[in-house]
């Protein structure tokens, strides 16, 4: 049976820690969850669409010369979509002009690891979060966000990159995962499903949510994204699940109301600046954290994932708008743009709160709780 949906303020059912998890049924999307292929774990480190701007924006991710300045978000590859549950393999599609790191599709050929070896790495994302197995880490303090309340001007670029809808963020959005773990927000994008089919990338005890937001950050220790790729903690992504609620979400409406203007792949528009923090859950103190990867080629590892325990509520109409407005490559709707969950391979998912205690309705057999790796920080 499936874990009931998390309520906006209730725990996600607890925290999941990464036990050594062979690639099992629950690591792959169920048939109803994902109709396409997924990619296997990967191994190296390259940028990926989901966490970075669009892959299609640059045929290749290469460092710019001094004269050109630092690599921009838009210059990086973007995230791709998921594939058939029957085939635990995320395939990437090389575009016509296609360079090895340009356009990807969920479910296309060749397989992602062939395009980017990193996609076959051992510590990939997304993963299934099992609250009962999460390691409670009191050292994980509430996240700190500074400068996320943007004024309406200057406007921001909202783009359909063929894999997702991406909002490029201006300089000045600072995020701290803790003391000395400081980041700058670069962009945000969404992952979703289709009518009646959920499309979050992460899952909770196998339960997939309707959609998921990712806010991608670069560590302040690095001046450029290409320098941070594959470096532990070089990139950090804040992720939150979106689910259906009774009311329209006015923060999301500022973006969703503009999707018709960018229905076509590769199109973009400008939107007024908004309160980016309003797109995230209000509780910054309860979350799960683990080290993984970008969820699309180049599947670079070393990415710190922070998945909020609290969900964000959107109306049914808004979720429908998200999943039914945009078009992707080859005259196909941009839908089900999520990668299958990947094996933990011994990773431990940490929780900032005692997620495994009294929170999961499925606790049948006793479980061995993992210990917190960050204890004493």
């Amino acid at each position: 049976q499936r874990l009931p949906r998390m309520q906006e303020d209730s725990p996600l059912g607890g925290g999941s820690s990464g036990e050594d998890d062979p690639l099992g049924e629950e690591d792959l999307p169920s048939e109803e969850d994902s109709p396409r292929e997924e990619d296997p774990p990967g191994e190296e480190d390259l940028p990926g669409e989901e966490d970075l701007p669009g892959e299609e924006d640059l045929p290749e991710v290469k460092p710019k010369s001094e004269e050109e300045g630092s690599l921009k978000l838009e210059d990086l590859p973007t995230v791709e979509a998921p594939g058939d549950p029957q085939e635990p393999q995320n395939n990437a599609h090389r575009d016509k002009e296609g360079d090895d790191q340009s356009h990807w599709r969920y479910g296309g050929d060749p397989p992602w690891p062939r395009v980017s070896p990193a996609c076959a790495g051992r510590f990939q994302s997304p993963v299934d979060i099992r609250p009962q197995l999460a390691a409670f880490c009191p050292a994980l303090r509430p996240l700190e966000l500074l400068g996320f309340q943007l004024p309406p001007l200057p406007e921001l670029r909202l783009r359909n990159n063929g894999h997702s809808v991406q909002l490029t963020l201006p300089p000045g959005l600072e995020m701290a995962l803790g003391p000395g773990r400081e980041y700058r927000a670069l962009q945000l994008h969404l992952h979703w499903g289709a009518a009646g089919r959920p499309g979050s990338e992460h899952t909770v005890e196998g339960h997939r949510f309707p959609a998921e937001i990712h806010v991608v950050h670069l560590s302040t220790a690095f001046a450029r994204v290409d320098e941070a790729l594959g470096r532990p903690g070089g990139l950090a992504v804040l992720a939150a699940f979106l689910e259906e609620g009774p009311e329209e979400n006015s923060a999301y409406e500022q973006l969703l109301s503009r999707l018709e203007e960018i229905a076509e792949e590769g199109s973009e528009t400008q939107v007024p600046g908004l309160d980016i923090s309003a797109l995230l859950p209000s509780d910054f103190s309860r979350y799960f954290q683990y080290e993984g990867s970008l969820t699309t080629p180049p599947c670079a590892q070393g990415v710190i994932w922070t998945v909020f325990n609290q969900t964000v509520m959107l109306s049914a109409k808004q979720l429908h708008t998200l999943s039914d407005t945009l078009w992707g490559p080859g005259d196909s709707r941009l839908q089900l743009n999520f990668r299958a969950t990947q094996p933990l391979n011994g990773r431990v998912i940490e929780a900032s709160f005692p997620a495994g205690v009294d929170s999961s309705p499925r606790a049948a057999e006793p479980v061995q709780l993992n210990s917190c790796l960050a204890a004493g920080d």
């Epitope: 309340q149 004024p151 309406p152 001007l153 200057p154 406007e155 006015s250 500022q254 400008q270 939107v271 007024p272 908004l274 309160d275």
Partner: antibody, heavy 124, light 107 residues
Framework: EVQLVESGGGLVQPGGSLRLSCAAS????????MHWVRQAPGRGLEWVAF??????????QYSASVKGRFTISRDNAENSLYLQMNSLRAEDTAVYYC???????????????WGKGTTVTVSS | DIQMTQSPSTLSASVGDRVTITCHVS??????LSWYQQKPGNAPKLLIY???NLHTGVPSRFSGSGSGTEFTLTIGSLQPDDFVTYYC?????????FGQGTKVEIK
């Protein structure tokens, strides 16, 4: 002195067209978002359209009530703003104001300079 | 669209009075609100921007306050010139919307 002067208003039949012009002076025209705002007789103010500044690519934005019928444009060499109005309806009858609002240093849209307005009457 | 509701629609007062006009906004717009004054037959003039900042050349008897969804325009001591119509406007997102106006008339 910063100034906006509208022209081109008049009487037109429903379904007809009209082109409004606005001559701007006294400021760096390309730095600013430029708007058209209208006011129907005895009514309140209604924003119609804007065109972005140079930094934002001079792209337009329209209110739902005029989208597809009106086209805003600008001639930066002439410091002029235009509003091409097609398929006019009786409800488009109003005083049309050319308005300056928003630039590289602004943090939101407020309308700090207004022209005197030009009257458009749509009637058969 | 963001809805703007001004109250009262008409306000009767005397010279020297302190008056307050309220603008209620249908959703949170932070401080992205402006106030305008319009005299009959003339174009509107900007009085207050960003909820509380006085535009250049505007007399100090005018002041603005508020944030989120509730805003006020206060005229500290009404002068004969002030018996006209006032509008609030949100600049958070387009379509930009105005309140329906408040007419200040002589009692």
């Amino acid at each position: 002195e910063v100034q906006l002067v509208e022209s081109g208003g008049g009487l037109v039949q429903p379904g007809g067209s009209l082109r409004l012009s606005c001559a701007a002076s006294g400021f760096t025209f390309t730095d600013y978002y430029m708007h058209w705002v209208r006011q129907a007789p005895g009514r309140g103010l209604e924003w119609v359209a804007f065109i972005r500044n140079k930094a934002s690519g001079y792209t337009p934005q329209y209110s739902a009530s005029v989208k597809g019928r009106f086209t805003i444009s600008r001639d930066n060499a002439e410091n002029s703003l235009y509003l091409q109005m097609n398929s006019l309806r009786a409800e488009d009858t109003a005083v049309y104001y050319c308005v300056r609002g928003g630039h590289a240093g602004s943090n939101y849209w407020y309308f700090d300079v207004w022209g005197k307005g030009t009257t458009v009457t749509v009637s058969s | 669209d963001i809805q703007m509701t001004q109250s009262p629609s008409t306000l009767s007062a005397s010279v020297g009075d302190r008056v307050t006009i309220t603008c209620h906004v249908s959703q949170n717009i932070n401080v992205w609100l402006s106030w305008y004054q319009q005299k009959p037959g003339n174009a509107p003039k900007l009085l207050i921007y960003q909820a509380s900042n006085l535009h250049t050349g505007v007399p100090s008897r005018f002041s603005g306050s508020g944030s989120g969804t509730e805003f006020t325009l206060t005229i500290g001591s009404l002068q004969p010139d002030d018996f006209v119509t006032y509008y609030c406007q949100q600049g958070q997102s387009y379509p930009f919307t105005f309140g329906q106006g408040t007419k200040v008339e002589i009692k």
